[in-house]
């Protein structure tokens, strides 16, 4: 008889989890020379010892303290880009200026990037049903206190001139209630971040205004300021352009200072 | 035009030290991440140190690390290279070189190459 | 500290086409650049972000490649190409440059 299961409100986790996980390790550290010391079956052990035979809703940061560990890493100084609602943009550029890091771009955010897990107490088994939805079931579920976790750390561990890409389309601009305002704005460590230059990326082709005096950024200034790290603020008019020219800055068109 | 004059080369004894400039022209010093490479006779070039913009980051090669040092004085538009206890493997053609940085909508990024040469000075180290 | 391998020397005739390559790049996110150094003068930009021409460079030449392998094509090979060329690559992690050894060009 099939055993009764727990019904959460969330999509179950992603098929050939366990099988996705660890080849995404194997592929990364075989291009990351800095990363070639990782055992990623110790890697995977890790990651499934945080949520395997746990009540989905009652994780903890402490959960995933082994896997973070393993996957300890660093960014150059000047190279970290946080971002808040605007991902693809985020990794586009990372992609075409290959020295600047997303979380998506470290060893963990890779593994784990658009993926959902959780398991089931008190059994081994993976609940590929459902998972608990973060507003609709609890905050406490396996994927976003994995996210809570390695965000921490990844704005703990940043140095140098810091830069966040924001999505200039949304009413809220800075949003304090996302990962990067509460959670990576916090974390950053005055001792060692000089400055935080937010890239507040245009929709509208049209669009002109400078969304750096946006409310929202000024708050955003505001709590940066309060704790001694300097705030500078750039409005991207054109992504498309930018990623062009990011990518070519010899172009022609792109000579222009636009 | 965009240059870059190095000065200070020329013959000096085993364990001496000598001093190399070199003096930018035609772009913002200030902004500029530069390089010191040399190239010893009939050979390939190295790279010998790097400094940022304002000074506050210093990378050597291990070859010169505790007896070079690399420095600039942006108000003079001056990059500097002190070098102590000179070995006969320093003798070399020293070049001085701006890193390749530009400015993408108003964003500063580093492209990871050297866009701009001096003529090189020549320093021979000989007893 | 590393270096980058080349070919010590590769050659063509007028009009060819020569591939000069560069191998030991040790990690995806280093770009790789390239410099020709014609004699008695001092080095000049090429390639640099592994393919990208700088401006006043001319078309016929083009770099490619990034990861672990990068390479340098001269197309309509000229007798003025005839120099050392050069692939560099700076570690973001440990902060250095890495030149490769050098190619010499010989246009017969």
């Known amino acids: 008889l099939p055993r009764w299961r727990q019904q959460w409100s969330g999509s179950g986790t992603t098929s050939r989890f366990p099988e996705t996980v660890l080849a995404r390790c194997v592929k990364y550290t075989e291009v990351h020379p800095e990363m070639r010391h990782v055992d990623c079956q110790s890697v995977w052990d890790a990651f499934k010892g945080a949520f395997i035979s746990k009540y989905p809703c009652n994780i903890t940061e402490e959960d995933y303290q082994p896997l973070v560990k393993l996957g300890t890493q660093t960014v150059p100084c000047n190279k970290t880009l946080l971002w808040s609602r605007i991902k693809d943009l985020a990794h586009q550029f990372t992609q075409v200026q290959r020295d600047m890091f997303t979380l998506e771009d470290m060893l963990l955010g890779y593994l784990a990037d658009d993926l959902t897990w959780c398991g089931e107490f008190n059994t081994f088994e993976i609940n590929y049903q459902s998972c608990p939805d973060w507003r609709k079931d609890c905050s406490n579920n396996p994927v976003s206190v994995f996210w809570k976790t390695v965000s921490r750390r990844f704005a703990e561990t940043a140095c140098g001139v810091v830069h966040v890409m924001l999505n200039g389309s949304r009413s809220k601009i800075f949003d304090k209630n996302s990962t990067f305002g509460s959670v990576e704005v916090h974390n950053l460590q005055p001792e060692k971040v000089q400055a935080l230059e937010a890239w507040v990326i245009h929709g509208g082709r049209e669009d002109s205004r400078d969304l750096c005096q946006d409310p929202t950024i000024k708050e955003l200034e505001s709590i940066i300021s309060k704790r001694n790290i300097r705030f500078f603020c750039k409005n991207i008019y054109r992504p498309d352009k930018f990623l062009q020219c990011v990518k070519n800055p010899e172009d022609s068109s792109c000579l222009s200072g636009i | 035009e965009v240059q870059l004059l190095e000065s200070g080369g020329g013959l000096v004894q085993p364990g001496g030290s000598l001093r190399l400039s070199c003096t930018g022209f035609?772009?913002?010093?200030?902004?500029?991440?530069m390089s010191w490479v040399r190239q010893a006779p009939g050979k390939g070039l190295e790279w010998v140190a790097d400094?940022?913009?304002?000074?506050?980051?210093?990378y050597y090669a291990d070859s010169v690390k505790g007896r070079f040092t690399i420095s600039r004085d942006n108000s003079a538009n001056t990059l500097y290279v002190q070098m102590n206890s000179l070995r006969a493997e320093d003798t070399a053609v020293y070049y001085c070189a701006k890193r390749m940085e530009r400015e993408v909508m108003t964003i500063k990024l580093d492209y990871h190459a050297m866009d701009v040469w001096g003529q090189g000075t020549t320093v021979t180290v000989s007893s | 500290q590393s270096v980058l391998t080349q070919t010590p020397s590769v050659s063509g005739t007028p009009g060819q086409r020569v591939t000069i390559s560069c191998s030991g790049i040790?990690?995806?996110?280093?770009?790789v650049s390239w410099y020709q150094q014609l004699p008695g003068t001092a080095p000049k930009l090429l390639i640099f972000?592994?393919?990208q021409r700088l401006s006043g460079v001319p078309d016929r030449f083009s770099g490619s490649g990034s990861g672990t392998s990068a390479s340098l094509a001269i197309s309509g090979l000229q007798s003025e190409d005839e120099a050392d060329y050069y692939c560099?690559?700076?570690?973001?992690?440990?902060?250095?440059?890495?030149f490769g050894g050098g190619t010499k060009l010989t246009v017969l």
């Open positions: 040790f990690n995806i996110r280093n770009y």
């Open positions: 560099a690559a700076w570690d973001i992690f440990l902060n250095v440059w890495v």
């Open positions: 035609g772009f913002t010093f200030t902004d500029a991440r």
């Open positions: 400094i940022s913009s304002y000074g506050d980051n210093t």
């Open positions: 972000k592994d393919d």
